[in-house]
C-alpha cells in the first residue's frame, strides 16, 4: 500500500486537527526541554508543508519519509547543543540511525518543574481566551513529561480535558465541578503512561516475540470465544501499532490503531460479545473502550488441555515441526481458560512448558519426561496467590498509607542504593495495589495485582536504567520480563550495603510542611522513613514505627503551635536526638 507522499497520506487519513496534535506530541516527546512556542512554530511549519503535499504529492520533498521530514525539522532547532548536549550529535546521522539516536535520548525523568495547577478562574479565563492554545499546551506538557505516552490515547485525554473545561467553566461552582475531573484525568493519565511504558520496554528490551506473547495471553483472556487465528491477527496488528508508537511513528500508530478498532467492530461477532457498546462510540472513545473492555465469558465445552499438550505421545513431533504455532496455541488455550491468572503468570507457565519440551524432546523417553509438566505449574500458581493473600491481609490491617510504609521499608532494605525519590515513588505506587485490587473477589485479584505490579516495577527499572546504582535491580530488571516481580520479591536485605552517614539536615523540617496537602505531607514523612532505613538498615519494624509515630506527633504539634518555625527548630533537634538514641545511631 505504497503512497507517493507518506506525509500527505497521513494528513488525509487523520485530518488536520489530529495531524497537528500528533506532530506536537511527537516533537515534545523528542525535545522535552524546548519551549512551547518553539514546538508550535515547528508544528505549523510541518503542517503547512503537509498541505502542499496534499495539493501535489509530487511536490519537492513530499516523497521523503516522515522520519526524514521530522528529523530535519527537529535538527533546525538553534539551541540543540546548549539544551540537549550530546543529543545534538544525532543530527549528524542519517535515517534510520538518526531516529534511533533521538529515541535513545528520551528521558523518563526529565528535569522539568512540577506542574502547578493554577486557580480555577485563571484556568477558565485561559481556556475561553484561546481554547486551541490551551489544549495544545496540555498535550505539550503531558508529552514532554511522559515521552512514551500512547499518543492516540493522549488525544482521548485531551478530548476529555476539553470537555471538562467546556462543562465546568459554565457551572455555578466551577471548582467543585472541575477539580475532581482534573484529579481523575491526572491519575488515569499517570496510570496510562506507566502501562504504555511497560509495553515499550517489553518491545525495546525483550523484543517483538516477548510483546506478542504478552498480547496473545491478554487477548485470549479478554476474547476467549475468539478462535486462535482471530487472536493471532489481532496480536499482529496490535504489535504493529505499539511498535510504531514506541518508535516515535505516531502518525502511523494513530492511523493503524483506528484501522484496528474499525476491524474489531466490524468483526465483533467473532471476537467478543462485550464490544457492542464500545463500537457505538466515536473513534477516540471507541479505541479506549476496546482497550479497557471486560473479559468475555468463557465458551462452553472446553475440554482438558492435558490431552493435546501432555498426554499425547506426539507432543514432540508437533512441537518440533510447528514450534511457534504449537506454543502459541498452548498459551492461547491456557489463557482463555484462566481469566483468574495474571498475564505474567501465564507467560511463566508457557515458558516452563517450552523449557520442559526443549529438555524432554531430546530425552530417551520424551513422553515419560514431560508427562508431569503440569505438576510443575502448581508452585508457580501458588506463589503469587499466597503473596497476594498475605499482602491483602496486611493492607486490610494497616490501610494504604501504613501499607505503603511497610513496602518502603521492605524495598529500601532490598535495594538501599536506589535514590530516595525513586524508592518513595515506586513504593507508594506498589502500595496502591491494595486499594486497587484487594477489594476484588479471588478470581480477579491476581490479574489485577500482579499485572499492576509489573507496571510499577517497570517504572523502577526505567528510572534505574538512567542512573544504575544497584546490580540487584539491574539483574531483576534485565534477566526476565515475566520474572521481575518474583525476582524483587525474593530479594532479602542487602547485607553488602554500607549504611549512609547520618545527616541532620535530612531530618530538619520547617513550617512549610503544615501548608502541604495530605499527599505531600505523606511524601515528606515517607522520604524521612526511607532515609532512616538507609542510615539504619537493620532497624526493626518496632523501632521504625516508634520513630515514625514520634515524627507524626512532632509535625502535628508544631503545625498547631503559634510560632511554628521555632517549634520545628527546637522540637526537631529533640526528635533527631531521640530518634538517634532509639535507633542506636
Amino acid at each position: 500500500d505504497a503512497h507517493k507522499s507518506e506525509v500527505a497520506h497521513r494528513f488525509k487519513d487523520l485530518g488536520e486537527e489530529n495531524f497537528k496534535a500528533l506532530v506536537l506530541i511527537a516533537f515534545a516527546q523528542y525535545l522535552q526541554q524546548c519551549p512551547f512556542e518553539d514546538h508550535v512554530k515547528l508544528v505549523n511549519e510541518v503542517t503547512e508543508f503537509a498541505k502542499t503535499c496534499v495539493a501535489d504529492e509530487s511536490a519537492e520533498n513530499c516523497d521523503k519519509s516522515l522520519h526524514t521530514l521530522f528529523g530535519d525539522k527537529l535538527c533546525t532547532v538553534a539551541t540543540l547543543r546548549e539544551t540537549y548536549g550530546e543529543m545534538a550529535d544525532c543530527c549528524a546521522k542519517q535515517e534510520p540511525e538518526r531516529n534511533e539516536c533521538f529515541l535513545q535520548h528520551k528521558d523518563d525523568n526529565p528535569n522539568l518543574p512540577r506542574l502547578v495547577r493554577p486557580e480555577v478562574d485563571v484556568m477558565c479565563t485561559a481556556f475561553h481566551d484561546n481554547e486551541e492554545t490551551f489544549l495544545k499546551k496540555y498535550l505539550y506538557e503531558i508529552a514532554r513529561r511522559h515521552p512514551y505516552f500512547y499518543a492516540p490515547e493522549l488525544l482521548f485525554f485531551a478530548k476529555r480535558y476539553k470537555a471538562a473545561f467546556t462543562e465546568c467553566c459554565q457551572a455555578a461552582d466551577k471548582a467543585a465541578c472541575l477539580l475532581p475531573k482534573l484529579d481523575e484525568l491526572r491519575d488515569e493519565g499517570k496510570a496510562s503512561s506507566a502501562k504504555q511504558r511497560l509495553k515499550c520496554a517489553s518491545l525495546q528490551k525483550f523484543g517483538e516475540r516477548a510483546f506478542k506473547a504478552w498480547a496473545v495471553a491478554r487477548l485470549s483472556q479478554r476474547f476467549p470465544k475468539a478462535e486462535f487465528a482471530e487472536v493471532s491477527k489481532l496480536v499482529t496488528d496490535l504489535t504493529k501499532v505499539h511498535t510504531e508508537c514506541c518508535h516515535g511513528d505516531l502518525l502511523e500508530c494513530a492511523d493503524d490503531r483506528a484501522d484496528l478498532a474499525k476491524y474489531i467492530c466490524e468483526n465483533q461477532d467473532s471476537i467478543s460479545s462485550k464490544l457492542k457498546e464500545c463500537c457505538e462510540k466515536p473513534l477516540l472513545e471507541k479505541s479506549h473502550c476496546i482497550a479497557e473492555v471486560e473479559n468475555d465469558e468463557m465458551p462452553a465445552d472446553l475440554p482438558s488441555l492435558a490431552a493435546d499438550f501432555v498426554e499425547s505421545k506426539d507432543v514432540c513431533k508437533n512441537y518440533a515441526e510447528a514450534k511457534d504455532v504449537f506454543l502459541g496455541m498452548f498459551l492461547y488455550e491456557y489463557a482463555r481458560r484462566h481469566p483468574d491468572y495474571s498475564v505474567v503468570l501465564l507467560l511463566r507457565l508457557a515458558k516452563t512448558y517450552e523449557t520442559t519440551l526443549e529438555k524432554c524432546c531430546a530425552a530417551a523417553d520424551p513422553h515419560e519426561c514431560y508427562a508431569k509438566v503440569f505438576d510443575e505449574f502448581k508452585p508457580l500458581v501458588e506463589e503469587p496467590q499466597n503473596l497476594i493473600k498475605q499482602n491483602c491481609e496486611l493492607f486490610e490491617q494497616l490501610g494504604e498509607y501504613k501499607f505503603q510504609n511497610a513496602l518502603l521499608v521492605r524495598y529500601t532494605k532490598k535495594v538501599p542504593q536506589v535514590s530516595t525519590p525513586t524508592l518513595v515513588e515506586v513504593s507508594r505506587n506498589l502500595g496502591k495495589v491494595g486499594s486497587k485490587c484487594c477489594k476484588h473477589p479471588e478470581a480477579k485479584r491476581m490479574p489485577c495485582a500482579e499485572d499492576y505490579l509489573s507496571v510499577v516495577l517497570n517504572q523502577l527499572c526505567v528510572l534505574h536504567e538512567k542512573t544504575p546504582v544497584s546490580d540487584r535491580v539491574t539483574k531483576c530488571c534485565t534477566e526476565s520480563l515475566v520474572n521481575r516481580r518474583p525476582c524483587f520479591s525474593a530479594l532479602e536485605v542487602d547485607e553488602t550495603y554500607v549504611p549512609k552517614e547520618f545527616n541532620a539536615e535530612t531530618f530538619t523540617f520547617h513550617a512549610d510542611i503544615c501548608t502541604l496537602s495530605e499527599k505531600e505531607r505523606q511524601i515528606k514523612k515517607q522520604t524521612a522513613l526511607v532515609e532512616l532505613v538507609k542510615h539504619k538498615p537493620k532497624a526493626t519494624k518496632e523501632q521504625l514505627k516508634a520513630v515514625m509515630d514520634d515524627f507524626a506527633a512532632f509535625v502535628e504539634k508544631c503545625c498547631k503551635a503559634d510560632d511554628k518555625e521555632t517549634c520545628f527548630a527546637e522540637e526537631g533537634k529533640k526528635l533527631v536526638a531521640a530518634s538517634q538514641a532509639a535507633l542506636g545511631l
Epitope: 486462535f228 465445552d301 482438558s304 492435558a306 493435546d308 498426554e311 499425547s312 510447528a322 504455532v325 488455550e333
Partner: antibody, heavy 120, light 107 residues
Framework: EVQLVESGGGLVQPGGSLRLSCAAS????????MNWVRQAPGKGLEWIGH???????YYATWAKGRFTISRDNSKNTVYLQMNSLRAEDTAVYFC??????????????WGQGTLVTVSS | FELTQSPSSLSASVGDRVTITCQAS??????LAWYQQKPGQPPKLLIY???DLTSGVPSRFSGSGSGTDFTLTISSLQPEDFATYYC??????????FGTGTKLTVL
Amino acid sequence: EVQLVESGGGLVQPGGSLRLSCAASGFSLSSYAMNWVRQAPGKGLEWIGHINAGDIAYYATWAKGRFTISRDNSKNTVYLQMNSLRAEDTAVYFCARGAGGFSTGPFKLWGQGTLVTVSS
Amino acid sequence: FELTQSPSSLSASVGDRVTITCQASESINSRLAWYQQKPGQPPKLLIYDASDLTSGVPSRFSGSGSGTDFTLTISSLQPEDFATYYCQGYGGSSTTTFGTGTKLTVL
C-alpha cells in the same frame, strides 16, 4: 453460521482417485485440527486422519499411503485425496472439527457427509 | 488402542434407565467422548472428557469412568433417545479411535 460442507463424492471405479473437499464457513479452519471420518453403509464410524494447526497430518494405520489430507487456508477448505480406491472404501465421508489446533477429539462440529461409491 | 462397546445392541422402553459401557485396550485417562447418531445424520457430541456434558444436551445423559472403563448412562429414556451411540478415545497420540457402536431400539 458456523458449518462444514463436504463435496466431491460420487461414483468412482476401483483403482480410481477422488478428491473430497470440506469448506468451512463462520470460522477459520487454520485454528483447528480438521478430521476426516468415514462410515460404510450400516457400519460404525472410522477415523481416517487429520491435519492440525501446524499443518502436520496424521493418519490411521490403514489409511497411510493411499489417503492424503491437505488444506488451503485462503479458501478455508480442507481436502482428502483418495487413491487406489477399492469397493470397501464405499462410505459416507464426514469432515469434523477438532476441539483445538492440535486436538484429536472431541468433535463438536460435523459436516453432513458426502457419499463415495466405488464400483465398476 | 481399541475400544469395545457393549452391548452392541439394546432394546429398552421410554422411562428406562440405560447403561452403555466402553472398554479401552489401554489407559486413556479421561479422554473419552460419547456421540449419538441418528440415520442420515452426522454424529452429535453428548459427553467429552468422560463426564463433561456438552452444552445443550439434556441432563439425563451422564458419563463416568477413567483409565480403561467408561460408562454412558441415560437416566430416563425419552422417545428421541433411540439411536446409535459411539464412544471415542482421544489424546494419547495424534490419532483417535471410535468404539464399535451400540444400537438402542424400542422394546
